[in-house]
């Protein structure tokens, strides 16, 4: 479960920029485009519009370079650098035959068997809830335990530092094995088991990770869009968790939607379970005071709380997690290749 290197990506933006820098024309065009890219939080320092003739010309020159189709990876080293390059080039997409709603992340799907040692779970009561069991499985794994303790420490205390808490949460969901991270957060609880539901809701330390006073959802999104990482994770979520129909079909795949959902944890747009008695998730924000943007705000809110693709993806994963413990395991160590394409 090591971090992917640039070389493992089909076309990483960092690699693509290196190639571009070896070509004088490409290098000059990229540097010019870099000055054209507006920061979403501040105006262009040069005052040059991103759609000015010179910027359009620079964009046109990059159309034939590998930069135009470059991607980043959620678990790569130097992810911030890669995303900065992606967003420098991204405005080019609006100038030609390219989709505007493409996730900056490449889907390199690695289907690994999920090996877990259940022998030590015998120290738990047989009727212990599954959230407790998945928490124990994390504790029994050195890497998962270390990463979980790191965010537990950063997110605890009366006066926790929220930015550090969020950074450690991101680190956990980026670096822990996907099976452990998903097991910990998407553990199934019996409807009447409020203790289990509360444990699940507290997994991401919401008292520290989420703002104490709920901000307006559109303000939260604007804040998110001003940050390349948060903007990337939000676009990833919008790409993969868009519902195609009322059945809950996802625009790409359930597994990719879940990956995108988990990728938002630790950003400004951190979602969480809203109650201990069901599996509804929501952003920690409100649409009060949205004025004439009320509809837009509610749509953003519903893309989490009433999204049939996301709801079905979470339900399917919880069903899978329940199945893991519903059989009589002859062997305490088992290996599962998940049906859902490594989700």
């Amino acid at each position: 479960n090591s971090l992917p290197t640039e070389n493992r990506l089909v076309n990483s933006c960092t690699q693509a920029r290196k190639k571009c820098e070896a070509n004088p024309a490409c290098k000059a065009a990229y540097q010019h485009l870099d000055s054209c890219t507006p920061s979403l939080s501040s105006p262009l320092p040069s005052g040059e519009s991103a759609t000015s003739a010179a910027c359009l010309e620079a964009a046109q020159q990059l159309r034939n370079s590998s930069l135009i189709d470059c991607r980043c990876h959620r678990r790569m080293k130097h992810q911030a650098t890669c995303l900065d390059i992606y967003w420098t080039v991204h405005p080019v997409r609006s100038l030609g035959d390219y989709e505007l709603d493409v996730s900056p992340y490449e889907d390199t799907v690695t289907s690994k068997p999920w090996k877990m040692n259940l022998s030590k779970l015998s120290m738990l009561k047989p009727d212990s809830d599954l959230c407790l069991k998945f928490a124990m499985l994390c504790t029994l794994n050195d890497k998962c335990d270390r990463l979980r303790k790191a965010y537990g420490e950063a997110c605890s205390g009366i006066r926790c530092q929220r930015h550090l808490c969020l950074a450690q949460l991101r680190s956990f969901f980026e670096k822990a094995a996907e099976s452990h991270a998903q097991g910990l957060l998407l553990c199934p609880c019996a409807p009447e088991d409020a203790g289990c539901g509360e444990r699940r809701r507290n997994t991401i330390a919401p008292s520290c990770a989420l703002p104490s006073v709920a901000p307006n959802c559109l303000d939260l999104r604007s804040f998110c869009r001003a940050d390349p990482l948060c903007r990337s994770r939000l676009m990833d979520f919008q790409t993969h968790c868009h519902p195609m129909d009322i059945l809950g079909t996802c625009a790409t795949e359930q597994s990719r939607c879940l990956r995108a959902y988990l990728g938002l944890i630790g950003t400004a747009m951190t979602p969480n379970f809203i109650s201990k008695v069901n599996t509804t998730v929501a952003l920690g924000c409100t649409c009060r005071g949205s004025g004439n943007l009320q509809d837009e705000c509610e749509q953003l809110e519903k893309s989490f709380s009433q999204n049939p693709c996301l709801m079905e993806a979470i339900a399917a994963k919880m069903r899978f997690h329940r199945q893991l413990f519903s059989q009589d395991w002859a062997d305490s160590t088992f290996s599962v290749m998940q049906q859902q394409n490594s989700s």
Partner: antibody, heavy 115, light 108 residues
């Protein structure tokens, strides 16, 4: 490569039956909702049926309800459409489709209902 | 059932012109579940737009979708020779899912 291939079409008499198959390859079939869509000669598209990724939910157009049955075998990566009590108005090219952001359609199989 | 009515039935335009196709629903449709397809003679349909305004994979930027409630629009900003085809809207918001009757975009 990623593709859907329909088979099982042909000429059948009114009142007869046919079973269409759609073989999927190049993607994880069990992850996707699947559809059947048909098109009568010279006419527009008509949605026929849909089945959820695990087969637990199925829905039909009013025109085929009670006569057609959609099913899937995820172990064989195959989608089926069992068509009974066929009528002349069922004559069409039948497409199976994966309707997501990167959609896939089969090449279609022609079903002709005629005496 | 939700009935989708497309207009016009036929649109005669020249390459380079702008095409505006309309799709009207008999009742409100959640824009998440409104799609547009392109079909050329002898070929299977191809998804162009999903969620009323999102381009499907590989679809050129000259295609755009908009609208909400009962009125939806597909716009082709500047027609290319390969864009002359029949276009269908589809709703997947209520069962049975339904298609519009289609708009044929032909060369003038």
């Amino acid at each position: 490569q990623v593709q859907l291939v329909e088979s099982g079409g042909g000429l059948v008499q009114p009142g007869g039956s046919l079973r269409l198959s759609c073989a999927a390859s190049g993607f994880t079939f069990s992850n996707y909702t699947m559809h059947w869509v048909r098109q009568a000669p010279g006419k527009g598209l008509e949605w026929v049926s849909v089945i959820s990724y695990d087969g637990s939910s199925t829905y039909y157009a009013d025109s085929v309800k009670g006569r057609f049955t959609i099913s899937r075998d995820n172990s064989k990566n195959t989608l089926y459409l069992q068509m009974n009590s066929l009528r002349a108005e069922d004559t069409a090219v039948y497409y199976c489709a994966r309707i997501v952001r990167m959609d896939i359609w089969g090449q279609g199989t022609l079903v002709t209902v005629s005496s | 059932d939700i009935v989708l009515t497309q207009s016009p039935a036929t649109l005669s335009l020249s390459p380079g012109e702008r095409a505006t196709l309309s799709c009207r629903a008999s009742q409100s449709v959640n824009s998440h579940y409104l799609a547009w397809y392109q079909q050329k003679p002898g070929q299977a349909p191809r998804l162009l737009i999903y969620g009323a305004s999102n381009r499907a994979t590989g679809v050129p930027a000259r295609f755009s979708g908009s609208g909400s409630g009962t009125d939806f629009t597909l716009t082709i900003s500047s027609l290319e020779p390969e864009d002359f085809a029949t276009y269908y809207c589809q709703q997947m918001d209520g069962f049975p899912f339904t298609f519009g009757q289609g708009t044929k975009v032909e060369i003038k």
